[in-house]
């Protein structure tokens, strides 16, 4: 039960258990049989952060701006100065003796943890359903666009670097395709009319013309069926040109109602 060593805040010197100096003070002289341990406070630019028997205090750390460092917390007689890195930089080690720029996450990778003054950017691969198409130190992986919510369909699958490409559904495609086809058909009909007009100007043995002036041709509403002698080319299924057969009525296909 008697002590088997000096007490926690003591040290052994010359058969005496002497008190250590408290943080913020340095040892001037050891205790003796006749005197106590003599300690002195550290100067303004120095510190000692533990109970000690040091004869010299430690110099406060210098936060060198040339190394990208700045003071985070000013040192006291009991604590060292704490340095941190300037904006956009982080420490190279735990002791923060110099700084380096934050890493950017490449396309296909997103930011898991944004860099701080003491830690670098942490990147993570974009999981399925997410992408990143930029090199950034701040951007996380973004989710693929949801085509369904826009009433569209996926035309091109997304990757970890690209978003999905959405396109119209079949009905919507028809709504786009039909007017285009009708437009093309209208142009073709105009060309046919021009062609017919040119043909009508030439002398024709089979059809007698009492008057020598050009004859005006009138087409009924359901074009083009007024001249069964001339086959008419029309664009139908998938805008593919087909030739209208003689003796058959020409009709434009209409989208079925569902």
């Amino acid at each position: 039960e008697p002590p088997t060593a000096c007490r926690e805040k003591q040290y052994l010197i010359n058969s005496q258990c002497c008190s250590l100096c408290q943080p913020g003070q340095k040892l001037v002289s050891d205790c003796t049989e006749f005197t106590e341990t003599e300690c002195l406070p550290c100067s303004e630019s120095e510190f000692l952060d533990t109970w000690n028997r040091e004869t010299r205090c430690h110099q406060h750390k210098y936060c060198d701006p040339n190394l990208g460092l700045q003071v985070q917390q000013k040192g006291t007689s009991e604590t060292d100065t704490i340095c941190t890195c300037e904006e956009g930089l982080h420490c190279t080690s735990e002791s923060c003796e110099s700084c380096v720029p934050h890493r950017s996450c490449l396309p296909g990778f997103g930011v898991k943890q944004i860099a701080t003054g003491v830690s670098d950017t942490i990147c993570e691969p974009c999981p399925v359903g997410f992408f990143s198409n930029v090199s950034s130190a701040f951007e996380k992986c973004r989710p693929w666009t949801s085509c369904e919510t826009k009433d569209l369909v996926v035309q091109q699958a997304g990757t970890n670097k690209t978003d999905v490409v959405c396109g119209p559904q079949d009905r919507q495609r028809a709504l786009v395709v039909i007017p285009i086809c009708l437009g093309i058909l209208f142009v073709i009909l105009l060309l046919v009319l021009v062609f017919i007009k040119k043909v009508a100007k030439k002398p024709n043995d089979k059809v007698p013309h009492p008057k020598q002036e050009p004859q005006e041709i009138n087409f009924p509403d359901d074009l083009p069926g007024s001249n069964p002698a001339a086959p008419v080319q029309e664009t139908l299924h998938g805008c593919q040109p087909v030739t209208q057969e003689d003796g058959k009525e020409s009709r434009i296909s209409v989208q079925e109602r569902q």
Partner: antibody, heavy 125, light 107 residues
């Protein structure tokens, strides 16, 4: 020079509590254990226990367990001893004493090298 | 608890006398013994620790000896300021008990 200055005399009624203080100076307070010893009138010395001023951890003599509380305030280098449920036989002079440890022949020998002047606590109805 | 028995309890002596006080422990305590001097109305004062080591500032006429269970405090030549009560204390096992004291008076 080392000094231990105690609080003044107290008169208490049975069942009450008393708190005695001991202010240290001239040395690093947290570096040395502080002990409490009492002496009834005309009697011998009785060891009550000690406190580690650094951690605040106390150790009490079995006789006083449950009635004594030893504390400290390092910011003012002061140790305290509180005794509760006082009885008339607690009438005594209460001393604080600093422990010193000497190392010799491979052993560590404790003793009390500095004492407070004492605080008389009288328990009377 | 370890019992310490001092003898004599009371001692009458003259200035210049050689005085010896004995302290017996109820069990072996190696050299974990200290001696204190106390004057009326004053706090005890450390004289000897580790059974035989003289505390700094204490006159060399005081000496201690012994080990195990039997210890002695000797005052080689009693001086007027030495008239007081002397206590032994064991620091081997808790509680660190004291002897009942030896009062040294002027003859």
């Amino acid at each position: 020079q080392v000094q231990l200055v105690q609080s003044g005399a107290e008169v208490k009624k049975p069942g009450a509590s008393v708190k005695v203080s001991c202010k240290a100076s001239g040395y690093t307070f947290a570096g040395y254990y502080m002990y409490w010893v009492r002496q009834a009138p005309g009697q011998g010395l009785e060891w009550m226990g000690w406190i580690n001023p650094d951690s605040g951890a106390p150790t009490y003599a079995q006789k006083f367990q449950g009635r004594v509380t030893m504390t400290r305030d390092t910011s003012i280098s002061t140790a305290y001893m509180e005794l509760s449920r006082l009885r008339s036989d607690d009438t005594a002079v209460y001393y604080c004493a600093r422990e010193k440890i000497y190392y010799g022949s491979g052993n560590y020998y404790p003793s009390f090298d500095y004492w407070g002047q004492g605080t008389l606590v009288t328990v009377s109805s | 608890d370890i019992q310490l028995t001092q003898s004599p309890s009371f001692l009458s002596a003259s200035v210049g006398d050689r005085v010896t006080i004995t302290c017996r422990a109820s069990q072996g305590i190696s050299s974990y013994l200290a001696w204190y001097q106390q004057k009326p109305g004053k706090a005890p004062k450390l004289l000897i620790y580790a059974a035989s080591t003289l505390q700094s500032g204490v006159p060399s006429r005081f000496s201690g000896s012994g080990s195990g269970t039997e210890f002695t405090l000797t005052i080689s030549s009693l001086q007027p300021e030495d008239f007081a009560t002397y206590y032994c204390q064991q620091l081997w096992s808790y509680p660190w008990t004291f002897g009942q004291g030896t009062k040294v008076e002027i003859k």
